[in-house]
């Protein structure tokens, strides 16, 4: 099908013209420009960058570019009263203190306003007590400690290694276990890949490097003081005691040099098994407390950070659609960084900048997309997805009626091995078709398609000859669009080889060492992977905004719904006796999935045959496709998580980064054997099956013939 038909423009202005205009050298130049100083949310430097991007997007040719500001709760260390952790002796003397800042990377020694490592939104406090090592502080780690090892974390300071799950979940788990403080550290087992040197000689984490990050449990709320509504000039703000998602105990992050000093003295229980051991030369004893000679020593935290309502700025650019200006395709990524943002976010922001430039070039030559494209540079993503969420709250009525798709554009790379895509099933075919048309940048795949290298390196676990595409979780700015509003969403980036590199994320994530040089020297010297990601993200936006019929295939949703129903059924069937006792049946869900499959199949047949020259019918069919994702939204939300409203997908309750399917049923079944009232617990399982079955059936009916 032609992407140009409806806009009556010269054939040269097609996807190829857009893709050919994207240049690696420009992405490189933009990345350099965006990474020379820190751009922490709420600072003057980040406001200045917002204005620079606004100005450049205007120059590139967008119809309008506006700043959208909000006053949200942010968190900063106290400049004159630094945060640190001590080992204290029986007299209360500090015999060891953790570092106050990271050693700056070469060339950046004189840069001011580098925020020292801290856990954003930690409350103030100076707790002291015995240490307990809790591995990754996952739900299962606390189960092991409390249930198997009978170790009580109440009144203890816990030390947990970063990795596996979102840090906010670690803190929540520690709070629930009764801990009075949390120390987070990066273990070389997770953040130091064998055979690679530390920065600045390689891409590994040095001993003084520390991962910053927020420790909120917002569950999609956005600004903690204005959940559900924009933090505008006339906002009513909750008191800090009623704020959403704030941790109640002090938390602080450290590097592995400092962790070594804390962990080497640990006594108490030995680690339960090898999965609790990292790579430091320490015993990884669980505790509580230090061993014999050091048993009178304690750990003391000194946390003095403050929470402050601060102004943030999104940049919103508009390229008006020629045919359907009231249909929005959104490309968004954040601008704020913890320090220099060499990867997170500026490797993504540089790609967005080049995509905007390419679209602008086409527009200056007389072309317009069929649908409106909105470009967003979000602020305060690192503080809880605040900029994107506040903007979506402010514009929710427009978005729910007009939002076609959202493509996320945070870090373009987390490695240089192969493509990684997470998206709604509606976009599977779009991604497959697009990557078949793009050249692979990978060594050994010269002249081959991106689809081919991706499929070879990251095969689908279910379908041979196809690449892996993952579920959307959270931890990034698509959250409000997908999980709250039900707008079809996707994200793409280049990633590492998960088989050979089992560390979590990339080693220098959220550290001062995430610089331009890190990318230019070690990850992507030719910027060919950045260019490929620009082609994937930009190509998706182009097709979504320009194809006559929306490039969504509802049959792919049918396939995954069956897979997810099978999975949740098999989880439930681990309790056959209870299912029988409480008359738990999944028949309604399987029936709804069967109906969805049949109706989706018939809809797809009609989609092939209808008269595309009839604008009313075309619009009707496209609206059914656009609103299908919306049909999976339950206005009441998930239990205790009102802003996670998608019935098919939600961020895992145990790891915000991961997506969970049929999350309502999954959470109702989780650890059900330990519930004090089994009848009530299984009643909730039945209710969640009912909600899921109803939602799938209701969604199916939106694809039926309208009359």
């Amino acid at each position: 099908k032609s992407s140009n038909e409806a806009t009556n423009i010269t054939p040269k202005h097609n996807m190829k013209a857009f893709l050919d205009e994207l240049k690696a050298e420009n992405i490189k130049k933009f990345l350099y420009n965006f990474t020379q100083i820190p751009h922490l949310a709420g600072t003057e430097q980040n406001f200045q960058l917002a204005k620079q991007i606004q100005s450049q997007w205007k120059e590139f040719g967008l119809d309008s570019v506006e700043l959208a500001h909000y006053d949200v709760l942010l968190s900063y260390p106290n400049k004159t009263h630094p945060n640190y952790i001590s080992i204290i002796n029986e007299d209360g003397n500090e015999i060891f203190n953790t570092s106050l800042f990271e050693p700056p990377p070469p060339g950046y020694e004189n840069v001011s306003d580098i925020v020292p490592p801290f856990s954003a939104f930690s409350p103030q406090g100076m707790p002291e007590g015995d240490l307990v090592y809790v591995n990754y502080a996952r739900t299962e780690d606390f189960f092991k400690l409390e249930r198997d090892m009978k170790i009580n974390c109440s009144g203890k300071i816990v030390i947990a290694r970063y990795g596996k799950v979102f840090r906010g979940n670690k803190v929540k788990n520690a709070q629930l276990a009764g801990a009075k403080g949390v120390i987070l550290y990066s273990d070389p087992a997770d953040y130091f890949a064998p055979g690679v040197k530390s920065y600045p000689d390689g891409w590994n984490l040095p001993g003084g490097g520390v991962q910053r990050g927020n420790i909120l449990n917002l569950n999609g709320a956005g600004d903690p003081l204005t959940p559900g509504y924009p933090a505008n000039e006339y906002a009513y703000r909750r008191g800090i005691a009623e704020a959403v998602g704030l941790p109640s105990i002090p938390v602080h992050p450290i590097g592995y040099y400092d962790a070594q000093k804390l962990l080497e003295k640990m006594g108490g229980s030995a680690p339960p098994d090898s999965s609790w051991r990292g790579s430091l030369k320490v015993p990884y004893n669980v505790g509580p407390g230090f061993t014999g000679n050091f048993s009178t020593q304690k750990v003391k935290m000194h946390i003095h950070s403050t929470n402050e309502v601060t102004r943030i700025y999104n940049v919103i650019g508009t390229l008006r659609g020629a045919v359907e200006p009231d249909r929005y395709v959104i490309l968004g990524g954040h601008r704020d960084s913890w320090v220099f943002g060499g990867i997170d976010p500026q490797s993504g922001a540089a790609v967005v900048h080049e995509i905007v430039r390419s679209f602008g070039t086409l527009k200056k030559e007389g072309w317009r997309p069929r649908r409106t494209i909105l470009f967003a540079s979000w602020d305060a993503e690192e503080f809880g997805l605040l900029g994107s969420t506040e903007w979506a709250e402010e514009n929710s009525r427009l978005l729910q009626e007009r939002g076609v798709a959202y493509i996320n554009a945070d870090s373009s790379i987390e490695g240089n091995y192969t493509l990684r895509v997470d998206c709604t099933p509606l976009m599977y075919s779009l991604v497959h078709n697009l990557t078949k048309e793009l050249k692979s940048p990978d060594e050994g795949f010269e002249g081959k398609s991106l689809y081919e290298s991706w499929t070879k390196k990251s095969p689908s676990p279910e379908f041979s000859g196809m690449p892996r595409i993952s579920k959307l979780g959270s931890g990034n700015d698509f959250e409000v669009f997908f999980q709250r509003l039900g707008i079809a969403s996707g994200r793409a980036r280049y990633t590492k080889n998960w088989e050979t590199n089992k560390f979590s994320g990339y080693p220098l994530y959220h550290s001062v060492y995430e610089t331009y040089e890190l990318v230019e020297k070690f990850y992507d010297p030719m910027f060919k992977y950045h260019l490929t990601v620009a082609q994937v993200r930009g190509g998706m936006v182009f097709e979504l905004a320009n194809s006559i019929v929306l490039p969504f295939d509802c049959r792919d949703y049918a396939v995954v719904l069956r897979k997810y129903a099978d999975k949740i059924y098999s989880i439930s069937m681990k309790h056959p006796q209870e299912m029988k006792t409480y008359s738990v049946s999944f028949d309604s869900l399987f029936s709804a999935v069967k109906n969805f499959t049949e109706i989706a199949s018939k809809f797809s047949e009609r989609l092939q045959d209808f008269d595309k020259s009839n604008p009313i019918v075309l619009r009707m069919m496209n609206d059914q496709l656009m609103f299908l994702e919306r049909a999976f939204i339950d206005p009441l939300g998930l239990p205790d998580r009102p802003f996670y409203r998608h019935v098919i997908y939600a961020p895992s309750s145990h790891n915000k980064y991961a997506g969970e399917s049929f999350p309502g049923i999954y959470d109702a079944l989780f650890d059900i054997e330990s519930k004090v009232d089994p009848s009530k617990a299984w009643g909730e399982v039945k209710r969640q099956i009912y909600v899921a079955a109803f939602t799938v059936q209701a969604a199916a009916e939106t694809l039926s013939e309208v009359a």
Epitope: Y84, F96, N97, T98, S99, L100, F101, E102, P103, P104, P106, E109, P206, G207, G208, G209, G255, Y257, D258, Q260, K261
Partner: nanobody, 123 residues
Framework: EVQLLESGGGVVQPGRSLRLSCAAS????????MNWVRQAPGKGLDWVAF????????YYADSVKGRFTISRDNSKNTLYLQMNSLKPEDTAVYYC????????????????WGQGTMVTVSS
């Protein structure tokens, strides 16, 4: 050129004070732990004090604990040693020495030395 230049030595009476300085050039002091080391006439080298790159930890030899204070001003690329209650046995050439490892939390091997400054404690 990478170098360390000590100053502030001299002759002083027992019980008095002296402040040594060590100016770094050619490398960023801010990234490295720093040491003071001394060599008494006819003796071997003795480690005196260590300060982490960020000033968060200071370690001292037992012989100087409570009398000497190591400090640094990263903005001036300078290391200091405040020596109080000096004793004749503190007589030595005092060297500042840069730690080999960026960000080390405890003293490690030294890789850059100054030329030293002589301190003589005598009545």
């Amino acid at each position: 050129e990478v170098q360390l230049l000590e100053s502030g030595g001299g002759v002083v009476q027992p019980g008095r004070s002296l402040r040594l300085s060590c100016a770094a050039s050619g490398f960023p002091l801010i990234s490295y732990g720093m040491n003071w080391v001394r060599q008494a006439p006819g003796k071997g080298l003795d480690w005196v004090a260590f300060i982490t790159y960020d000033g968060s930890n200071r370690y001292y030899a037992d012989s100087v604990k409570g009398r000497f204070t190591i400090s640094r001003d990263n903005s001036k690329n300078t290391l200091y040693l405040q020596m109080n209650s000096l004793k004749p046995e503190d007589t030595a050439v005092y060297y500042c020495a840069k730690d080999r490892i960026v960000g080390a939390r405890v003293p490690d091997a030294y890789d850059i030395w100054g030329q030293g400054t002589m301190v003589t404690v005598s009545s």
